[in-house]
């Protein structure tokens, strides 16, 4: 059921040529878990730089360092993956640059070609020295979290020794992992103490446990696999925009909506209005008016400019962005002050980075 009654028809028209949005795939920075990553904001003449991740303001913490035009992530984890943006705020305008961070293991899609040291993993013991299983190469087991793009090949390794030579079996989410549990099955390379899954899909997500045992004991190690889906996403709007603004009667004001979309976005600026003295229709839904939308006859749809405002222009302004995948919207309030009252510091007409949430 619609959440509003439209005063004007909002049928999607052919969108504006994509000169104002970063629609192509942004630059991708790849790091392995545990590594540090440093990215420089590729924008010039920045008075103030602010950063966002997946549309949410990014502040410094114990792993994130923001120094000037540089972003540093220490000890990256798969959770650091996402869409980042730096916004350079200048005296007259602002500009945003987007980039992707992908924290993932570079996993070979080959069949153990990278196991040049595989023979060393298979440790033979003096037959008299009976020994419970033990790990022979814990370095290869340090990365417990594996975030892998769909269709890639994944390899988990548990190099072990013991006497007699231990056996290895694998569990998925704590239960026996059977070949029929996934299309295409999987391979176990006992010589290399490895489990190989080719062409992973989202249903492969989960915890994988190797259990290595002999008659003297049992050890286990668990990996977590996250399959990163490659599919187009709905629009992302920069946090804090549009920003609340105020102006005096007769003044001018601008609202800005910064959009990232990997499918052509359609932008609408919408305002709550009154019809026949009422803000709500007979169905109880608010009346809304489309003030501007991206289209052939529309210039920069990311900016809504209001000139010579009156008290009637006060209220909530919604930036609504859609593509064929989904929608996103954020809003801001316009306060219209009497002529004699000047706007306060936090009510600048143009959006300031101070307002990034």
């Amino acid at each position: 059921r619609p959440s509003f009654s439209l005063v004007e028809d909002t049928t999607l028209e052919p969108e504006e040529p994509p000169t104002k949005y970063q629609i192509s795939q942004p630059e991708v920075y790849v790091a392995a878990p545990g590594e540090s990553l440093e990215v420089r904001c590729l924008l010039k003449d920045a008075a103030v730089i602010s950063w966002t991740k997946d549309g949410v303001h990014l502040g410094p913490n114990n792993r994130t360092v923001l120094i000037g035009e540089y972003l540093q992530i220490k000890g990256a984890t798969p959770r650091d993956s996402g869409l980042y943006a730096c916004t350079a705020s200048r005296t007259v305008d602002s500009e945003t640059w987007y980039f992707m961070v992908n924290v993932t293991d570079a996993i070979s899609s080959g069949d153990d070609e990278d196991d040049t040291d595989g023979a060393e993993d298979f440790v033979s013991e003096n037959s008299n020295n009976k020994r419970a299983p033990y790990w022979t190469n814990t370095e290869k087991m340090e990365k417990r979290l594996h975030a892998v793009p769909a269709a890639n090949t994944v390899k988990f390794r548990c190099p072990a020794g013991g006497n007699p030579m231990p056996t290895m079996r694998w569990l998925k989410n704590g239960k026996e992992f059977k070949q029929e549990h996934r299309i295409g099955g999987y391979k176990v390379r006992n010589q290399h103490w490895s489990l190989i899954m080719e062409s992973v899909v989202p249903s492969d997500k989960g915890n994988y446990t190797c259990v290595v045992e002999n008659e003297y004991g049992s050890i286990n190690h668990t990996y977590h696999l996250d399959v990163v889906e490659r599919s187009p996403h709905r629009p992302i709007l920069q946090a804090g925009l549009p920003a609340n603004a105020s102006t005096v009667v007769g003044g001018d004001v601008e609202f800005v909506c910064k959009v990232y979309s990997d499918a052509q976005p359609h932008i609408q600026w919408i305002k709550h209005v009154e019809k026949n003295g009422s803000k709500y229709g007979p169905d109880g839904l608010p009346y809304l008016k489309v003030l501007k939308h991206s289209g052939i006859n529309s210039s920069n749809a990311e900016v809504l400019a209001l000139f010579n405002v009156t008290e009637a222009d006060a209220g909530e302004y919604i930036c609504k962005v859609s593509n064929y995948i989904g929608q996103a919207n954020q809003s801001a309030w316009l306060t219209v002050l009497p002529k004699q009252q000047a706007p306060g510091r936090e009510k600048e007409i143009t959006a300031s980075p101070d307002y990034l949430e």
């Epitope: 059921r1 795939q25 064929y324």
Partner: antibody
Framework: QVQLVQSGAEVKKPGASVKVSCKAS????????IHWVRQAPGQGLEWMGA????????SYNQRFKVRATLTADTSTSTVYMELSSLRSEDTAVYYC??????WGQGTTVTVSS | DIQMTQSPSSLSASVGDRVTITCGAS??????LNWYQRKPGKAPKLLIY???NLADGVPSRFSGSGSGTDYTLTISSLQPEDFATYYC?????????FGGGTKLEIK
């Protein structure tokens, strides 16, 4: 696991209406458009329209705007496509799709007197 | 409405062949183009979105290229399971029109 499950095949007489359902699971239902696409025998794919379940926003192919109605029930994560004033040319397989990435299995609608 | 024209309408090829299918739009669609594979009795499967991006679980032998009004789907080395009908689609503006399809058959 994202899944779209459509209702079963329908046989209708000319002039009648048909209502096809598409039940979604495995994702946040309100975050994605559900599109409807049909394919008539020996023909190509034809986009009919889309609905955004979060607020009920709809967009239609002008060819179907008068006869097609898309609705969404967020309580059951189900989208419905109703096509009225059926004619023999509407005989086709009707698909729902989440943003064209995940598709339902298809519903065959046969219009015959 | 934006018209999408695919060529060829049918194509015979052998396993291991490199195959190219083209799609033309009646106006600039700025890379807003998807490619699908459809097998008889099955729903279409998204292969490429945004003209060049490989969708989930799609083998890397599939690739997409193009800009403006001209787009191409390439299969670098045909596999037995690739014999199907392929469609391009405009996702720039509604109605989201499809090309007429290219039927890829075994030679």
């Amino acid at each position: 696991q994202v899944q779209l499950v459509q209702s079963g095949a329908e046989v209708k007489k000319p002039g009648a209406s048909v209502k096809v359902s598409c039940k979604a699971s495995g994702y946040t239902f309100t975050n994605y458009y559900i599109h409807w696409v049909r394919q008539a025998p020996g023909q190509g794919l034809e986009w009919m329209g889309a609905i955004y379940p979060d607020n009920g926003d709809t967009s239609y192919n002008q060819r179907f705007k008068v006869r097609a109605t898309l609705t969404a029930d967020t309580s059951t994560s189900t989208v419905y496509m109703e096509l009225s004033s059926l004619r023999s040319e509407d005989t086709a397989v009707y698909y729902c799709a989440r943003a064209f990435t995940y598709w339902g299995q298809g519903t065959t609608v046969t219009v015959s007197s | 409405d934006i018209q999408m024209t695919q060529s060829p309408s049918s194509l015979s090829a052998s396993v291991g062949d490199r195959v190219t299918i083209t799609c033309g739009a009646s106006e600039n669609i700025y890379g807003a183009l998807n490619w699908y594979q459809r097998k008889p009795g099955k729903a279409p499967k998204l292969l490429i979105y945004g003209a060049t991006n490989l969708a989930d679980g799609v083998p890397s032998r599939f690739s997409g290229s193009g800009s403006g009004t001209d787009y191409t789907l390439t299969i670098s080395s045909l596999q037995p399971e690739d014999f199907a009908t392929y469609y391009c689609q405009n996702v720039l503006s509604t109605p989201y029109t499809f090309g007429g399809g290219t039927k890829l058959e075994i030679k």
